[in-house]
């Protein structure tokens, strides 16, 4: 995949950022040991990776969270990798679910998502979770990225 | 990524090896259905994958472990993917954490880590865990690898 | 990996399909937001991805399942990524294991497998689980794919 100017490498890896926003969409930052290969992929509004070129991409996310069965809802913790293409509704690409731990005060668990998807120019991918307050933001625990095949 | 001599494929996949060494760094071997594309990536001292060429790499590790909450420390089992570049301290690229199981004698869990990172010539990546004695070395359970984009 | 006609992109991502078959091999379909780059990779009999070209492939699978410790066997839930090459016995490439949850009626957990492997022309990869009836088939929960380096 070492490519010429006509076909440059496109890759990104961004790092989780704690947020006070009351939204299920996780926030990310270009900080620490991040990757942003060039302007053909961008992090927009700290929440979505947007690509300029059509093609096949391997997209991945890792989410570490700490939760307790008694303090959480009955529903499991779910992380979703979602796609928003121009002129289309958003859709779920991948999901993972983990039942809350019985450990006190909370039990840590990590989820990894990854798959190959066709993206259109201007398409954005983002990560949703059921409870962002449970997400762990320590070094390396929660990250999000992609690479163009 | 099918490439010419100027730009060969670089990829590795190595298999976990039980070790009596008293270190948190996991040991690996070129055994079973392993991959070592060429000498542009090498397994050094059974513990680190070292690359000769600068570039973007997708690096991954999978660790399966068996632990019990009562027999383990309060802290969760943590697997860390770490980077050591020449002339730099080692640094954490990715981490995953799983709280110990209440199952007896121990409960198995699997962790997967993966992300895209820029590596310098001579850079090494390795995997650290909180308790190597809990790692499962049965066929396919614990492995480590990379591919150059 | 943007390639010419001589060296086209090869990638697939298929979606889990509930099955009444009494087999441990998971079933997949080209439905939803699936990927099938061209006829150099095919989904055969709804259960295996078969490649026509030799080379290095990153192969991955994600399995979400819901199980309960009391209602399940003592053994953990295991997902295996397996290889069948022409004229060879099948072999395990990767495995992950998760102990059943104590949550009622069942606790959801997600497993992710991925690694780089050399495949021969005509080689097939497939996914085995200990109990297919426990697998979750909701949108995005369980998928399987590969990409040629």
């Amino acid at each position: 995949m070492q490519k010429g100017d006509q076909n440059p490498q496109i890759a990104a890896h961004v790092i989780s950022e704690a947020s006070s926003k009351t939204t299920s969409v996780l926030q990310w930052a270009e900080k620490g040991y991040y990757t942003m290969s060039n302007n053909l992929v961008t992090l927009e509004n700290g929440k979505q990776l947007t690509v300029k070129r059509q093609g096949l991409y391997y997209i991945y996310a890792q989410v570490t969270f700490c939760s307790n069965r008694e303090a959480s809802s009955q529903a499991p913790f779910i992380a979703s990798l979602c796609l928003k293409s121009p002129g289309r509704f958003e859709r779920i690409l991948l999901r993972a679910a983990n039942t809350h731990s019985s450990a006190k005060p909370c039990g840590q668990q990590s989820i990894h998502l990854g798959g190959v998807f066709e993206l259109q120019p201007g398409a954005s991918v983002f990560v949703n979770v059921t409870d962002p307050s449970q997400v762990s933001h320590g070094t390396g625990f929660t990250s999000f990225g992609l690479l163009k095949l | 990524m099918q490439k010419g001599d100027q730009n060969p494929q670089i990829a590795a996949h190595v298999i976990s090896e039980a070790s009596s060494k008293t270190t948190s760094v996991l040991q690996w071997a070129e055994k079973g259905y392993y991959t070592m594309s060429n000498n542009l990536v090498t397994l050094e001292n059974g513990k680190q994958l070292t690359v000769k060429r600068q570039g973007l790499y997708y690096i991954y590790a999978q660790v399966t472990f068996c632990s019990n909450r009562e027999a383990s420390s309060q802290a969760p089992f943590i697997a860390s993917l770490c980077l050591k570049s020449p002339g730099r301290f080692e640094r954490i690229l990715l981490r995953a954490a799983n709280t110990h199981s209440s199952a007896k004698p121990c409960g198995q869990q699997s962790i997967h880590l993966g992300g895209v990172f820029e590596l310098q010539p001579g850079a090494s990546v390795f995997v650290n865990v909180t308790d190597p004695s809990q790692v499962s070395h049965g066929t396919g359970f614990t492995s480590f690898g990379l591919l150059k984009l | 990996m943007q390639k010419g006609d001589q060296n086209p992109q090869i990638a697939a991502h298929v979606i889990s399909e509930a099955s009444s078959k009494t087999t441990s091999v998971l079933q997949w379909a080209e439905k939803g937001y699936y990927t099938m780059s061209n006829n150099l990779v095919t989904l055969e009999n709804g259960k295996q991805l078969t490649v026509k070209r030799q080379g290095l492939y990153y192969i991955y699978a994600q399995v979400t399942f819901c199980s309960n410790r009391e209602a399940s066997s003592q053994a953990p839930f295991i997902a295996s990524l397996c290889l069948k090459s022409p004229g060879r016995f099948e072999r395990i490439l990767l495995r992950a294991a998760n102990t059943h949850s104590s949550a009622k009626p069942c606790g959801q957990q997600s497993i992710h497998l991925g690694g780089v492997f050399e495949l021969q022309p005509g080689a097939s990869v497939f996914v085995n689980v200990t109990d297919p009836s426990q697998v979750s088939h909701g949108t995005g929960f369980t998928s399987f794919g590969l990409l040629k380096l």
Partner: nanobody, 116 residues
């Protein structure tokens, strides 16, 4: 049991020299890249120098380049740091460590004080 025992630290005048040693035991020394790190009073850890397993590749922090020389004797399981043209800012506790898994094992360190 893994042990790293640093020695050779002393009080020395600016411009002077010292040779630090690190005796390793409990692991296969020749399998490990090794390094020297230091901690000045009230400061964080600073990477100083490192050497590969065979001793064929060495690296130095800019602040010590041309003044310090790292070496090893695998037959004696010992790491060395030859320190020349010492300056006041080299005052620190010096530790040796493995380059991979550096936080697994630490010795007591050896104190180098550069003062007139």
């Amino acid at each position: 049991e893994v042990q790293l025992l640093e020695s050779g630290g002393d009080l020395v005048q600016p411009g002077g020299s010292l040779r630090l040693s690190c005796a390793a035991s409990g692991f296969t020394f020749s399998d490990e890249g090794m390094m020297w790190v230091r901690q000045a009073p009230g400061k964080g850890l600073e990477w100083v120098s490192e050497i590969n397993q065979q001793g064929s590749a060495t690296y130095y922090a800019d602040s010590v380049k041309g003044r310090f020389t790292i070496s090893r004797d695998n037959s004696k399981n010992t790491l060395y740091l030859q320190m020349n043209s010492l300056r006041a800012e080299d005052t620190a506790v010096y530790y040796c460590a493995k380059t991979i898994g550096m936080f697994d094992y630490w010795g007591q360190g050896t104190l180098v004080t550069v003062s007139s």
